[in-house]
């Protein structure tokens, strides 16, 4: 197996009860071949379901900064630039993996964590609830 | 846990030249406190910029399966259910972190990798380029 110089307080991976751990190289390789710098950059403003981006920071998480989208309105923007409440703005959400320091504040020990983030908004036709 | 035949060239973390590595517990903790089961589940169909989800599978990546959104139309769906080409359907993209087996086929050695995924689509007003 892999042996690492161990801090006495760090988890013992040889313990049979210890959850499965792996080695991860944190030098990030960027596979984004898309060189278009714009990408989604101005969509938040041009969308019929515009959104604002909010910075979510957590030093115990890697990456520590995640941007969260919040839809500006409950309705959607129509051709006249007004909000049309016959349509709904909804967040497009995605589950992503992050690394959470565990135990807290440990520089070299993490746990994979799944979090739900809102990436942007889209305009949908409302669900009509028919009253019997 | 996952068992994979070990590549004889798997790294020795005691090597001083080995890039910064950390221990990661792969037992995923799910922090999604949002109990709304609907989430984005049916938005892909109800959106004015509908999309299809395509399965992207790669056994050398963790998670091995990622769903990619592809907008169905260049335009957006109008109130009559027709495609309006005066508006544009565009993908909302997000950079996410994944783990890439490195060297390939190693069960316990990964490198962090950043990839760009399309999560869904939104309807935007086109950029009008005026010809001089």
């Amino acid at each position: 197996g892999i042996t690492i110089p161990r801090n006495p307080g760090c988890p013992n991976s040889e313990d049979k009860n210890f959850p499965r751990t792996v080695m991860v190289n944190l030098n990030i390789h960027n596979r984004n071949t898309n060189t278009n710098p714009k990408r989604s950059s101005d969509y938040y403003n041009r969308s019929t379901s515009p959104w604002n981006l909010h910075r979510n920071e957590d030093p115990e998480r890697y990456p520590s900064v995640i941007w969260e989208a919040k839809c500006r309105h409950l309705g959607c923007i129509n051709a006249d630039g007004n909000v049309d409440y016959h349509m709904n703005s909804v967040p497009i959400q995605q589950e992503i993996l992050v690394l959470r320091r565990e135990p807290p504040h440990c520089p070299n020990s993490f746990r994979l964590e799944k979090i739900l983030v809102s990436v942007g908004c889209t305009c949908v036709t409302p669900i009509v609830h028919h009253v019997a | 846990g996952i068992t994979i035949p070990r590549n004889p060239g798997c790294p020795n973390s005691e090597d001083k030249n080995f890039p910064r590595t950390v221990m990661v517990n792969l037992n995923i903790h799910n922090r999604n406190t949002n109990t709304n089961p609907k989430r984005s589940s049916d938005y892909y169909n109800r959106s004015t910029s509908p999309w299809n989800l395509h399965r992207n599978e790669d056994p050398e990546r963790y998670p091995s399966v990622i769903w990619e959104a592809k907008c169905r139309h260049l335009g957006c769906i109008n109130a009559d259910g027709n495609v309006d080409y005066h508006m544009n359907s565009v993908p909302i993209q997000q950079e996410i972190l994944v783990l890439r087996r490195e060297p390939p086929h190693c069960p316990n050695s990964f490198r962090l990798e950043k990839i760009l995924v399309s999560v869904g689509c939104t309807c935007v007003t086109p950029i009008v380029h005026h010809v001089a």
């Epitope: 403003n45 604002n52 981006l53 909010h54 910075r55 979510n56 969260e68 989208a69 919040k70 839809c71 500006r72 309105h73 409950l74 309705g75 909000v83 409440y85 709904n88 703005s89 909804v90 967040p91 959400q93 809102s118 908004c121 949908v124 409302p126 669900i127 009509v128 609830h129 | 406190t33 949002n34 709304n36």
Partner: antibody, heavy 124, light 113 residues
Framework: QVQLQESGPGLVKPSETLSLTCTVS????????VSWIRQPPGKGLEWIGI???????DYNSAFKSRVTISVDTSKNQFSLKLSSVTAADTAVYYC??????????????????WGQGTLVTVSS | DIVMTQSPLSLPVTPGEPASISCKSS????????????LAWYLQKPGQSPQLLIY???TRQSGVPDRFSGSGSGTDFTLKISRVEAEDVGVYYC?????????FGQGTKVEIK
């Protein structure tokens, strides 16, 4: 703690521009949006407009042609400008913080902290 | 614009007794995507600025006593004070945050008998 404080001239002449400043402390500007709300003497509350965390704005259409809301993040200050004022613009003007809820994916238009308000009289 | 209509406009109360204020909206404030009603209640005490009591119809803002409760859905909403205390006097406003511009009711003045 969270504080908002409005300041500006208490008297403005008709047809001139009303200019107010809201200085905030105790919260992060990049997270929160701020609205301006007014209350004519003895009357109810009227929402004027909002400036979002990214500097974007949205205005009540009743004021749209003559209102501007801006922010100077270096000074933690928001400003309201209302042009071509008349006696009907006499009111107590409040700046208020829009509530921020972490796991909620819409901008919020409830107001969870208010300034003490400043009375602006429009008179010649 | 959405019209918010409160009743009564004036409410004399006895300390220790319950009190109730009604607010009606000219359009439904129920958002179909999350089943939340976009209605809030504020109290403006004499000489002070308004303070948020309740949002999303029934969620109490932190620090607000549990004698305050909100109910309703769609267009009809109610604020109840289970046992009025002397410090509860002032003008109560309902506010909708569904439609822009975001509008307030005309206010209900609560005073001790």
């Amino acid at each position: 703690q969270v504080q908002l404080q409005e300041s500006g001239p208490g008297l403005v002449k008709p047809s001139e521009t009303l200019s107010l400043t809201c200085t905030v402390s105790g919260f992060s500007l990049p997270s929160h949006s701020v609205s301006w709300i007014r209350q004519p003497p003895g009357k109810g509350l009227e929402w004027i407009g909002i400036i979002w965390n990214n500097g974007g704005t949205d205005y009540n259409s009743a004021f749209k042609s003559r209102v501007t809301i801006s922010v100077d993040t270096s000074k933690n200050q928001f400003s309201l400008k209302l042009s071509s004022v008349t006696a009907a613009d006499t009111a107590v003007y409040y700046c208020a913080r829009n509530m921020y809820i972490t796991d909620y994916y819409y901008e919020n238009y409830f107001f969870d902290a208010w300034g003490q308000g400043t009375l602006v009289t429009v008179s010649s | 614009d959405i019209v918010m209509t409160q009743s009564p406009l004036s409410l004399p109360v006895t300390p220790g007794e319950p009190a109730s204020i009604s607010c009606k909206s000219s359009q439904s404030l129920l958002f179909s995507e999350n089943q939340k009603n976009y209605l809030a209640w504020y109290l403006q005490k004499p000489g002070q600025s308004p303070q948020l009591l309740i949002y999303w119809t029934s969620t109490r803002q932190s620090g607000v006593p549990d004698r305050f409760s909100g109910s309703g859905s769609g267009t009809d909403f109610t604020l109840k004070i289970s046992r009025v205390e002397a410090e509860d006097v002032g003008v109560y406003y309902c506010q909708q945050s569904y439609y822009t511009p975001y509008t307030f009711g005309q206010g209900t003045k609560v005073e001790i008998k």
